[in-house]
């Protein structure tokens, strides 16, 4: 199988949480708990 | 409002190449993975590939060899590209912006 | 690659009543991250799919609570408490936790 082409396993983690769990219906840009720039997002 | 919209020829000859544009609206595509997903008529769906914020991309191994997924983000539009089309690649293909957000699909036959 | 088998493959529910839907995997969807990237599709008559539930159990904004998604692993379920006319449709199940992502083969919801 293709595999990812990222350079660190948090980046892969990251892009995969954000396309699989992001609320669209929501003003919060994601779950509880993705991190973006060292924040966590509520 | 994030939109997805699709376009590209309805009837594509067998051998031939398929190629349709994926117009994207609401969002930035150096942000978010958009992906391919297509449905036979009356069948499941299949997932073809996605195209990541950065430009990397992943396909899916059955189809490695005739996919290409591509983008420009300025234009915001995703580009996918599928060769030596045959009979069983009549579907309706859909772009999506990760799992939440569905482009309306545009179904294409591949037919003589 | 990761087959997802979802049963029934028809089912028909009076209004009102209760339905589940079951989505079996061929192996483990827990990912090296600890999360698990299942999710439920509804695609209703001719329409695109929608996102209903992620992560295996969190509802999309907008998804009624009668809505509730659970399993863990490789076995996993979709329930709808009360089922209403709007319901129907195929549901599927959508896994990324493998490439290359897959879905079940889908199951019909028809009203009694």
């Known amino acids: 199988d293709a595999e990812f082409r990222h350079d660190s396993g948090y980046e892969v983690h990251h892009q995969k949480l954000v396309f699989f769990a992001e609320d669209v219906g929501s003003n919060k840009g994601a779950i509880i708990g993705l991190m973006v720039g060292g924040v966590v997002i509520a | 409002q994030v939109q997805l919209k699709e376009s590209g020829p309805g009837l594509v000859a067998p051998s031939q190449s398929l190629s349709i544009t994926c117009t994207v609206s609401g969002f930035s595509l150096t942000n978010y993975g958009v992906s391919w997903i297509r449905q036979p008529p009356g069948k499941g769906l299949e997932w073809l590939g996605v195209?990541?914020?950065?430009?990397?991309?992943n396909y899916h191994s059955a189809l490695i060899s005739r996919l290409s997924i591509s983008k420009d983000n300025s234009k915001s539009q995703v580009f996918l590209k599928l060769n030596s089309l045959q009979t069983d690649d009549t579907a309706t293909y859909y772009c999506?912006?990760?799992?939440?957000?569905w482009g309306q699909g545009i179904p294409v036959t591949v037919s003589a | 690659d990761v087959v997802l088998t979802q049963t029934p493959l028809t089912l028909s529910v009076t209004i009102g009543q209760p339905a589940s839907i079951s989505c079996k995997s061929s192996q483990s969807l827990l990912d090296s991250d600890g999360r698990t990237y299942l999710i439920w599709l509804l695609q209703r008559p001719g329409q695109s799919p929608k996102r209903l539930i992620y992560l295996v159990s969190t509802l999309d904004s907008g998804v009624p609570d009668r809505f509730t998604g659970s399993g863990s692993g490789t076995d996993f379920t979709l329930k709808i408490s009360r089922v209403e006319a709007e319901d129907l449709g195929v549901y599927y199940c959508?896994?990324?936790?493998?490439?290359?992502?897959?879905f079940g083969g889908g199951t019909k919801l028809e009203i009694k």
């Open positions: 959508w896994q990324g936790t493998h490439f290359p992502w897959t």
């Open positions: 999506t912006k990760g799992a939440g957000s």
């Open positions: 195209i990541w914020g950065d430009g990397s991309t």
